[in-house]
Amino acid sequence: VEIYTSGALEAVNGTDVRLKCTFSSFAPVGDALTVTWNFRPRDGGREQFVFYYHMDPFRPMSGRFKDRVVWDGNPERYDVSILLWKLQFDDNGTYTCQVKNPPDVDGLVGTIRLSVVHTVPFSE
């Protein structure tokens, strides 16, 4: 399994953001597919659970991401993205996307470094 993410992402406080994670695999996607999203705060601290998918999406029932994260993936498109809304400054940190698609061997974990800012400078 190979995992692809945007690497780094900047988003404005209070808005919603799609944490995009896609993958490739020699094995067809089936019921064995599992996806785990975790978060490590920028200021350190322990890793926190964000989301889990296995045939169905499983949102966190408690913690900082409760009621703020939903599945926006599509296994047929090898897409295991999630949507995080109402961004807060303490959402700054590294999000990891881990995909298992047996019988393919596990790949590296995909990472997204999210920076939550007051405003995004217009750079076009």
Epitope: V70, W71, D72, N74
Partner: antibody, heavy 114, light 107 residues
């Protein structure tokens, strides 16, 4: 086989309301973001709404914001689009689509005219 | 909102020809671009997603490429059944937007 079947279209006067439905089958409906897209008589495509899984957060372009409401009933595997304060420029074929457009229904026609 | 400028509007080709359609985004959309085929009287069908990935069951004569603002869709060897309108779409940022379409006609 993924199947999306829209219904509820018709002729409505300007200022009127209409509710479209989309019956989904062949996949786990509750696990997918769902969208409505319309195609004008000039064949231009315009995305009009989408709704997430889970808590059902919704997104609209400015052209329909405040007038259209997308909703879903996961128990019935059905997507809805409530349209109010309709204008002549809302005349179009309305399609329901799975996720970000990987499967589309056959469409239901909406005509806004007096 | 992001404008997707699609060219050309019309293409008249012979079976066996190679066809290229381009789409230019008004700002970067990463690789969040899809290409659709709409045959007469039918709804659009997804051919390419994430700029270069063929969707399930799509023949390999259809390919896509590009990143950022410039995207290309190619039919390597046009067949009579490819008569259709082709649209590009960005879903990088809301509102998702479509190109104006390219009508492909076969001589």
């Amino acid at each position: 086989e993924v199947k999306l079947v829209e219904s509820g279209g018709g002729l409505v006067q300007p200022g009127g309301s209409l509710k479209l439905s989309c019956a989904a089958s062949g996949f786990t409906f509750s696990s997918y973001t769902m969208s409505w897209v319309r195609q004008t008589p000039e064949k231009r495509l315009e995305w009009v709404a989408y709704i997430t899984t889970g808590a059902g957060r919704t997104y609209y372009p400015d052209t329909v914001k405040g007038r259209f409401t997308i909703s879903r009933d996961n128990a019935k595997n059905t997507l809805y689009l409530q349209m109010s304060s309709l204008k002549s420029e809302d005349t179009a074929m309305y399609y329901c689509a799975r996720h970000r457009g990987d499967y589309w229904g056959q469409g239901t026609s909406v005509t806004v005219s007096s | 909102s992001i404008v997707m400028t699609q060219t050309p509007k019309f293409l008249l080709v012979s079976a066996g020809d190679r066809v290229t359609i381009t789409c230019k985004a008004s700002q970067s959309v990463s690789n969040d671009v899809a290409w659709y085929q709409q045959k007469p009287g039918q709804s659009p069908k997804l051919l390419i997603y994430y700029a270069s990935n063929r969707f399930t069951g799509v023949p390999d004569r259809f390919t896509g490429s590009g990143y950022g603002t410039d995207f290309t869709f190619t039919i390597s060897t046009v067949q009579a059944e490819d008569l259709a309108v082709y649209f590009c779409q960005q879903d990088y940022s809301s509102p998702w937007t479509f190109g104006g379409g390219t009508k492909l006609e076969i001589k």
